[in-house]
Interface confidence: medium
């Protein structure tokens, strides 16, 4: 029962992670206008995403525009787009694998095969979490680097946007959920639930430690 409960928790976490990842990828809030001191550096608020950017005028009117050319986009933006889409597709594949091996499905009858499918789905979710983490951390690094670069004009300085925080959350949930699914699977048929719990308790801190390693505050 504990194993089934952990499986359900793992899948719920990965589903939440996937939704977070989707919203993070779609929202044009990866980079936002920097505030320096008490005043905003430009008259408008600028939001930049992977697919479009938006300018919010002081009047409250918002104008969004999709990036013009696919070919001329900077390589970091193209890479972030690709990784985001791949991460979402990988997570979907992980979900399909999980459903094939879930306790409550009849796709696969044999217990060992089910366990292997659940373990595989857990690994796939962990991979998805890492793929989500790469563009988010890379973009955050670029924002922080530009913030302190004297040859980046003030109008181009940006701060970390809500999409990045959602991305970190998505990655954390996918890693945690995937980790839980990996932990619910016995390495052999003879071990009981206590074995899964023991494995879970030792690996959980290692998984939960991940997202907090990234500095998100000390950049202003």
């Amino acid at each position: 029962m504990a194993s089934a409960g952990m499986q359900i928790l793992g899948v719920v976490l990965t589903l939440l992670g996937w939704v977070n990842g989707l919203v993070s990828c779609a929202l044009p809030m990866w980079k936002v206008t920097a505030f320096i001191g008490n005043s905003i550096v430009v008259a408008q608020v600028v939001w930049e995403g992977l697919w479009m950017s938006c300018v919010v005028q002081s009047t409250g009117q918002m104008q969004c525009k999709v990036y013009d050319s696919l070919l001329a986009l900077p390589q970091d933006l193209q890479a972030a787009r690709a990784l985001c889409v791949i991460a979402l597709l990988v997570a979907l594949f992980g979900l399909l694998v999980y459903l094939a091996g879930a306790k409550c499905t009849t796709c696969v009858e044999e217990k060992d095969s089910k366990a292997r499918l659940v373990l595989t789905s857990g690994i796939v979710f962990v991979i998805s979490g890492v793929l989500t983490l790469i563009p988010v951390c890379w973009t955050a690094h670029a924002i922080i680097r530009d913030f302190y670069n004297p040859l980046v004009a003030e109008a181009q300085k940006r701060e970390l946007g809500a999409s990045l925080y959602l991305g970190w959350a998505a990655s954390g949930l996918l890693l945690l959920g995937g980790g839980l699914l990996c932990c619910t699977c016995p390495s052999g048929g003879s071990q009981g639930p206590s074995h899964y719990m023991a494995r879970y308790s030792t690996s959980a801190p290692a998984i939960s430690r991940g997202p907090s390693e990234y500095p998100t505050k000390n950049y202003v």
Partner: antibody, heavy 126, light 108 residues
């Protein structure tokens, strides 16, 4: 509208210095980089360097290092380019330009308009 | 430094003809860092195409840009008299932001 107005033509002797000014208007001066480009008579464009008026940060073309100094006066929204130890091959039109936003993705969604000054002819002759 | 080599140096073309100017870069750069300028006699240069393929404001649609890595192209599909000018490519990939030698387009 955005305007960059440069100082008038100069005639200098070899070994002297020249200081070209570039007065900006129509935008927030500290928000954009200013680059300097020169063009010898009948020749192509040559990038000299840039300055960030907001921070004073500069990057010079190695060819001019030690001879060129770029500065700004934010109170008057004016950029300056001083070239020392002038030689006859420094005879050229010197342009200042306000560069399109770089270092951020928004550049790829909005027109990459670069504004240029009208140019300042500096003649170096003995 | 990155060296940009333009070809041809000079092109004499009849109106309505297609013009192709190439810019060869000494080391591979991102397409977002390659720009084209138009300059007419006794005028300041004008940004013409930015990020390889994006037309700047007011540039007619007969102009186009393409390329990647080390080879970039500016194309005028049907030359008009007002297009007579010198065209320069420039890279913003690394300092110094070097220019190509220029291609002068003349109307026959």
């Amino acid at each position: 509208q955005v305007q960059l107005v440069q100082s008038g033509a100069e005639v200098k002797k070899p070994g002297a210095s020249v200081k070209v000014s570039c007065k900006a208007s129509g935008y927030t001066f500290t928000n954009y980089l200013i680059e300097w480009v020169r063009q010898a008579p009948g020749q192509g464009l040559e990038w000299m360097g840039l300055i960030n008026p907001g921070s004073g940060g500069t990057n010079y073309n190695e060819k001019f290092k030690g001879r060129v100094t770029m500065t700004t006066d934010t109170s008057t929204s004016t950029a300056y380019m001083e070239l020392r130890s002038l030689r006859s091959d420094d005879t050229a039109v010197y342009y200042c330009a306000r560069r399109s936003p770089l270092g951020s993705w928004i550049y790829y969604a909005y027109d990459g308009v670069a504004y240029w000054g009208q140019g300042t002819l500096v003649t170096v002759s003995s | 430094e990155i060296v940009l080599t333009q070809s041809p140096d000079f092109q004499s073309v009849t109106p309505k003809e297609k013009v192709t100017i190439t810019c060869s870069v000494s080391s591979s750069i991102s397409s977002s860092n390659l720009h084209w300028y138009q300059q007419k006699p006794d005028q300041s240069p004008k940004l013409w195409i930015y990020g390889t393929s994006n037309l700047a404001s007011g540039v007619p649609s007969r102009f186009s840009g393409s390329g990647s890595g080390t080879d970039f192209t500016l194309t005028i599909n049907s030359l008009e008299a007002e297009d007579a000018a010198t065209y320069y490519c420039q890279q913003w990939s690394s300092y110094p932001h070097t220019f190509g030698g220029g291609t002068k387009v003349e109307i026959k």
